[in-house]
């Protein structure tokens, strides 16, 4: 029986060039986290983080994906089109999958402010 | 054309070490994952482990750690794999292979270095 | 270490049959298996990832399915090139592992 639930950022806004911070969260659960897969909006993969093999980027992204904080990701170098959702798949053991959604806007404004809060979704 | 081209054939006495290297071309080397592979004659695959150019992070399979040491210079775009305190449970062909797109698999592989490890 | 179980070890059969491998891992990887083809005295190529996505510039009579545990690959009428060994390989965890191998030859 799957118990747990996925934390994540929510709904999150960022300046253009600058950088966020994409974090899930897994809790009330005391399954074994073996991969964390995050993809975009078009399914596309960004990242993966794997317990044992480390870390994979997707290499069209080496250069501007970082790895961290944590099982978390941090997206560099924003574009406009980087506007729009991600997810963050949990591979457990022995629960199964979990999945969490988190949408970036990414604004042009210099006034744009980084909010980032901890939502369930 | 996405290429690796790795270094000729080794004869070498047990005991001793020896170097082999893989150069790739026709992408970008800092942004793929380079694996290397064992295969013995006639038998199956065995993965070593694989060298991150863009940090030089490296991941190994346990059974080779203190046998084999990867490294890669991105100069060059060359990946390096050292083998050290050879038996003749070392001869085999060695192959070193790009990492896939989407995770730890094998898309572009090298024409493989044989090592034959006699006194 | 994740044991990859690949079957029949050998295989026979003509030009224009369907063949199918099977590859079956003893927990489970979701969908993170590869096949590769390797012919004699050559290097592997990818065929398939992620149990069933189809390598670039493969064609399109192989076709892998499956997850968890259970894995197939499937070749429609067979071509005189499609001969060789097909190995399957796990990518979710360390070590990764292959198959030992089934072996396609020419009835």
């Known amino acids: 029986m799957m118990t747990g639930t996925i934390e994540t950022t929510g709904n999150i806004s960022a300046k253009k060039g600058g950088s966020v911070i994409l974090q899930c969260h897994l809790s009330s659960t005391m399954a074994q986290v073996t991969q964390v897969n995050w993809e975009q909006h078009d399914h596309s993969l960004l990242a993966i983080r794997n317990a044992e093999l480390g870390w994979h980027i997707y290499p069209a992204f080496k250069d501007r994906v970082a790895p961290g904080p944590g099982l978390g990701l941090t997206l560099q170098s924003l574009t406009m089109n980087d506007t729009g959702e991600y997810f963050c798949t949990y591979h457990t053991y022995p629960d199964g999958t979990y999945r969490g959604r988190i949408f970036l806007e990414v604004l042009e404004s210099s006034v744009a402010e980084h909010s980032a809060r901890f939502q369930i979704p | 054309e996405v290429q690796l081209q790795q270094s000729g054939p080794e004869l070498v006495k047990p005991g001793a070490s020896m170097k082999m290297s893989c150069k790739a071309s026709?992408?970008?080397?800092?942004?793929?994952?380079m694996h290397w592979v064992k295969q013995k004659p006639g038998q199956g695959l065995e993965w070593i482990g694989y060298i991150d150019p863009y940090n030089d992070g490296s991941k190994y399979n346990e059974k080779f750690k203190g046998k084999a040491t990867l490294t890669s210079d991105k100069s060059s775009s060359i990946a390096y794999m050292e083998l050290s305190s050879l038996t003749s449970e070392d001869s085999a062909v060695f192959y070193c292979?790009?990492?896939?797109?989407?995770?730890?698999?094998?898309?572009?592989w090298g024409a493989g270095t044989t090592v034959t490890v006699s006194s | 270490d994740i044991q990859m179980t690949q079957s029949p070890a050998s295989l026979s059969a003509s030009v224009g049959e369907t063949v199918t491998f099977t590859c079956r891992t003893n927990e489970n990887i979701y969908s993170y298996l590869t096949w590769y083809q390797q012919k004699q005295g050559k290097s592997p190529q990818v065929l398939v990832y992620?149990?069933?996505t189809l390598a670039e510039g493969v064609p399109s009579r192989f076709s892998g399915s499956g997850s968890g545990t259970q894995f197939s690959l499937k070749i429609n009428s067979l071509q005189p090139e499609d001969f060789g060994s097909y190995f399957c390989q796990h990518h979710f965890g360390n070590p990764l592992t292959f198959g030992a191998g089934t072996k396609l030859e020419l009835k």
């Open positions: 992620n149990a069933k």
């Open positions: 292979a790009r990492g896939g797109s989407r995770g730890w698999y094998f898309d572009v």
């Open positions: 026709g992408y970008k080397f800092t942004s793929y994952v």
